[in-house]
Interface confidence: low
């Protein structure tokens, strides 16, 4: 689509005569008829296949034509065409005398013709005017012409349609050859794809307008390059979405189970050595002079009853001192000057002679101890209960009262809530500090995976661009059926169709 433009510049008819040679009365009131048609080697009569245009009366006899509207006419004259410009043409320009105001061809006598010129040739589309002058015996016409493309048409023959736009179908202006030039921030064949924020992750991010970075599910951050860990992940990280890879010293599905209580909480006091002994459990090995689960209690050195055989203990600044009863000596009154003849065994203990009667040993009845059976047994002094269990004396025996989650004579066993396989339908069981949690396979839900559910993978409307979503019931996944012009597993990528252009 384009326009053939004809600019009339000057017409000379000095004698004011018609083509027949007759003079015009009172002068030649001149107007023009123009016929544009396909190339003919000899311009013959027939339809003006490319169009016609006529002017009002532009002057009398000889006159110059202004470069604008004259008496309602237009200069240059416009001959629009709605086809590919062929590059060749035939042009006929007739000058006529108008005796009255009716300029219709049927209203004029044939002899009102002043002059007729016909040219033919090649003409390329372009902005430059071709200047021409045609002279006959009595008249001279100076004019120029060119072919330009209509708005939105481009190329050597005005066949390339390009309409600048900034909407859903594209964001571009048109180059002189009709090719698209994308507006800043847009790319693609039809400039429909926004250029996302610089650095926006290619797979994990996308955008619907320039300089934007929207994250796909499971990703976050300005550039969508940070994965989102499993919901509830406490002390863990991820390298792909919904992971929960535990930090050093943490365990469990949500990395919320403390496997390094010693480091994280430093429970042991007074320089004691801490040993991890399972989830949230530990043992403190106290330095001399301290006791308690966390070695928080300071001991008198006499509290450990170091003096044997009934010796009495006296605390001193640098330790302790044993005052031995008659018949005993040594740092802890451990050496005896007594023999079985002296009946040294108390509380019903039996005396046995050793070293040919130079020494003896007492065999104590239950609940008594000491070299002379002089001490009643406290079965809790050795702290036998593990994992923070509380030791209770029960007459001749002792008993451990365990903290929740532990069992066994000495609270040494960790109770597993998962031991009885509580998760139905192949659910995975996870021990938590205060109970358990079931991770259900696809198609099941409930605290124990006991509820069968039908997964509608389409429920979240995963398909874009008005695509139809189908649920694959065998795999509980979705399939997007893309409308014309879109591709991708979610129909998120336009392919530029329907096209806006005929090439």
């Amino acid at each position: 689509s384009g326009v053939f433009q004809l600019q009339l510049q000057e017409f000379i008819n000095e004698r004011g005569v018609l083509a027949s040679g007759r003079p015009c009365e009172p002068g030649c009131r001149t107007f023009f008829r123009v016929c544009l048609k396909h190339f003919q080697a000899v311009v013959s009569p027939g339809p003006c296949t490319f169009g016609t245009v006529s002017t009002p009366v532009l002057g009398t006899n000889s006159f110059a034509v202004r470069d604008d509207s004259s008496g309602g006419g237009r200069n240059p004259l416009q001959l629009p065409f709605n086809f590919t410009w062929p590059g060749t043409f035939s042009l006929i320009i007739e000058a006529w005398h108008a005796p009255g105001d009716d300029l219709r061809p049927e209203a004029l006598p044939p002899d009102a013709l002043i002059s007729k010129i016909a040219i033919q040739g090649s003409l390329a589309v372009g902005q430059n005017w071709l200047l021409d002058e045609q002279t006959s015996t009595l008249t001279r016409l100076r004019y120029s012409y060119r072919v330009i493309c209509s708005d939105n048409y481009y190329g050597d023959n005005c066949s390339r349609l390009c309409k600048k736009r900034n909407d859903h179908f594209g964001h571009y202006v048109c180059q002189p050859d009709g090719n698209l030039s994308c507006l800043p921030g847009w790319t693609g064949e039809y400039c429909q794809q926004p250029i996302c924020l610089s650095g926006c992750h290619e797979q994990n991010g996308y955008c619907s307008k320039p300089a934007e970075c929207l994250c796909r599910p499971g990703w976050q951050g300005r550039l969508c390059n940070e994965c989102i860990p499993h919901n509830g992940c406490r002390h863990g990280t991820c390298s792909t979405p919904w992971q929960c890879t535990c930090d050093e010293g943490w365990g469990g599905l949500f990395c919320d189970q403390d496997l390094n209580y010693c480091t994280h909480h430093s429970p042991c006091k007074n320089g004691a050595t801490c040993s991890n002994s399972g989830q949230r459990s530990y043992t403190c090995t106290c330095r001399p002079g301290y006791t308690g689960v966390d070695c928080e209690l300071e001991l008198s050195e006499c509290d450990s009853n170091p003096c044997r055989n009934g010796g009495s203990c006296k605390d001193q600044e640098d330790g302790y001192h044993c005052l031995c009863p008659p018949g005993y000596y040594g740092l802890h009154c451990e050496h005896s000057t007594l023999s079985c003849a002296d009946s040294p065994c108390f509380n019903g203990g039996s005396c046995r002679e050793r070293n040919q009667g130079a020494n003896y040993a007492c065999e104590c009845p239950p609940n008594f101890t000491g070299s002379n059976c002089e001490k009643k047994v406290d079965r809790c002094t050795s702290n036998p209960c593990a994992n923070g269990g509380q030791c209770l004396n029960r007459g001749p025996s002792r008993m451990c009262r365990c903290r929740p989650g532990f069992t066994g004579t000495y609270c040494e066993l960790h109770v597993s809530d998962c031991a009885r396989n509580p998760c139905a339908h192949g659910g995975t069981c996870h021990d938590l500090e205060n109970g358990l949690m079931c991770t259900c396979p696809a198609g099941f839900s409930g605290r124990r995976c006991e509820v069968r559910t039908s997964i509608d993978a389409c429920a979240s409307s995963p398909c874009f661009n008005r695509a139809t979503c189908y649920t694959d019931l065998s795999t509980d996944t979705f399939v997007c059926n893309c409308p014309y012009g879109f591709v991708g597993s979610r129909c998120e990528f336009p392919v530029g169709l329907p096209p806006s252009f005929p090439w």
């Epitope: 909407d167 008005r466 409308p483 252009f501």
Partner: antibody, heavy 124, light 112 residues
Framework: QVQLVQSGPGLVKPSQNLSLTCAIS??????????WNWIRQSPSRGLEWLGR?????????DYAVSVKSRITFNPDTSKNHISLQLNSVTPEDTAIYYC??????????????WGQGTTVTVSS | DIQLTQSPLSLPVTPGEPASISCRSS???????????LDWYLQKPGQSPQLLIY???SRASGVPDRFSGSGSGTDFTLKISRVEAEDFGIYYC?????????FGRGTKVEIK
């Protein structure tokens, strides 16, 4: 203001072809910012979308699956109208047939205006 | 295809009283751009349907402000704050998320 005026026969015999016309004024049938839809209405099916045609450097059609094998849209740029042809009609095709313009804005198209409707009865 | 279910099918109303119509979709009409692709049309007796509301809540040109639309995803509502004589007719919801476009069965608002 865009106006749509429909014309076509009110009675068609079974197995014959139905042809309806929708004349457009106030817009061009080959406008690159409109689509021309056909909808029918019957007591049994309610409002049923049959399809649409639109021009984007060339003509494109979308048809409803229920009529895809029998329906054709024919735009006529010289007369600035759209015609619908439905082949091999049956009494099931008895309905009021509407054409409607879908304005193709950046984000959305909706049906406005509608033609006055053509009541078609399929009967021998 | 997306199914639209309207309720009630019939709604007797006294002029001046409010009215409310529900439209439920078999799948979400909400796209990631934030728009729900649902329109409301009114068909008066002996006339063609006419556009009332598009994109859930945008009133078409010339539609009085007593009409309002709301909802998102699969549940949508059309409300008339005070029904007037010219409001009687059949109201249809239509989804334009994807072709084929589909309509509800209609709600007939009639004089009580």
């Amino acid at each position: 203001q865009v106006q749509l005026v429909q014309s076509g026969p009110g009675l068609v015999k079974p197995s014959q072809n139905l042809s309806l016309t929708c004349a457009i004024s106030g817009d061009s049938v080959s406008s690159d910012s409109a689509a021309w839809n056909w909808i029918r209405q019957s007591p049994s099916r309610g409002l049923e979308w049959l399809g649409r045609t639109y021009y984007r450097s060339k003509w494109y059609n979308d048809y409803a699956v229920s009529v895809k094998s029998r329906i054709t849209f024919n735009p006529d740029t010289s007369k600035n109208h759209i015609s619908l042809q439905l082949n091999s009609v049956t009494p099931e095709d008895t309905a009021i047939y509407y054409c409607a313009r879908e304005g193709d804005n950046w984000n959305y198209g909706w049906l406005d205006p509608w033609g006055q409707g053509t009541t078609v009865t399929v009967s021998s | 295809d997306i199914q639209l279910t309207q309720s009630p099918l019939s709604l007797p109303v006294t002029p001046g009283e409010p009215a409310s119509i529900s439209c439920r979709s078999s799948q979400s009409l909400l796209l990631s751009n934030g728009y729900n692709y649902l329109d409301w049309y009114l068909q008066k007796p002996g006339q063609s349907p006419q556009l009332l509301i598009y994109l859930v809540s945008s009133r078409a040109s010339g539609v009085p402000d007593r009409f309002s639309g709301s909802g998102s995803g699969t549940d949508f509502t059309l409300k008339i704050s005070r029904v007037e004589a010219e409001d009687f007719g059949i109201y249809y919801c239509m989804q334009a998320l994807q072709t084929p476009y589909t309509f509800g069965r209609g709600t007939k608002v009639e004089i009580k």
